[in-house]
């Protein structure tokens, strides 16, 4: 049977390779039954996760799942790092797996790598 607990479906050890200067939406897939929970994003700093209070967020509703979205408009080099979403549900705190953003600063890259290059040559992300 379907669980009626809130579930956050960020994939474990997930990663995104993105370019500074581009817009990006980081999605937290949320499953809930009745009342939509209060969801927040935080950014990991060592073992603590610092709540992102003043960032633009929005909800996207689909048939079987909803997405709580953190907007990067645009992506900045210091957006590099790991993020986690969490939900308050019936006075329980549910935390997602963390997801990591690898930001390439295009100003420091000699040329903008294509998506195919980034997929086949991941070391481009670290130069």
């Amino acid at each position: 049977k379907e669980s009626c607990d809130v579930q956050l479906y960020i994939k474990r050890q997930s990663e995104h390779s993105i370019l500074a200067g581009d817009p990006f939406e980081l999605e937290c897939p949320v499953k809930y039954c009745a009342n939509r929970p209060h969801v927040t994003w935080c950014k990991l700093n060592g073992t603590t996760c610092v709540k992102l209070e003043d960032r633009q967020t929005s909800w996207k509703e689909e048939k079987n799942i909803s997405f709580f979205i953190l907007h990067f408009e645009p992506v900045l080099p210091n957006d590099n790092g790991s993020y986690r979403c969490s939900a308050n549900f019936q006075s329980n705190l549910i935390e997602s797996h963390s997801t990591t953003l690898y930001v390439t600063d295009v100003k420091s890259a000699s040329e903008r790598p294509s998506k195919d290059e980034m997929a086949s040559r991941p070391w481009l992300l670290y130069r």
Partner: antibody
Amino acid sequence: EVQLQQSGADLVKPGASVKLSCTASGFNIKDTYVHWVKQRPEQGLEWIGRIDPANGHTKFDPKFQGKATITADTSSNTANLQISSLTSEDTAVYYCVSDYYGSSLLDYWGQGTTLTVSS
Amino acid sequence: EVVMTQTPLTLSVTIGQSASISCKSSQSLLDSDGKTYLNWFLQRPGQSPKRLMHLVSKLDSGVPDRFTGSGSGTDFTLKISGVEAEDLGVYYCWQGTYFPYTFGGGTKLETK
């Protein structure tokens, strides 16, 4: 019913490249990771790597980096493993494996594709 | 990489007898999320591997409760209480805590 259907057995010549496919039914591969596992004749299992079909991000065992390429096409719900510069060492059964919502738990296995490299 | 060492290589049992397989990792498999990503798989002759156990001790659906998984850190054990003919094959442990993910070398369970 959740299923992973892999492409049929392949016989290829040394030095060539080959692309193996894995088509999912009963779930959306965007919601999972798809892994590839190698098993040489009468040998154990080796994890090659995995793809996140939602964004194309891949991870590999370093020994397969540069040798294997993993791609995914979410419109056809298919993941692919391409192996280049084939040698007899690449003769093996290759399995695609998915895990539910990227849980890293290797839930569902395809039936395997037998690849034979021979001149 | 994390090395997974399984013992014994081969286990010869009489049907109905109990069996125990050991799996040791070269470092602790406890992840930062508090979970231990250690699975057990069975590969019967001519078939794809099938997961029996995940997160050390969680039995997969359809797997009989004669299978039990235990352990923590670097030492793990799969026990079968009363081996049946359908249990014969090669057992693999696997770690999904660290990249690259790695399998143990396998333990062949056969009849005497």
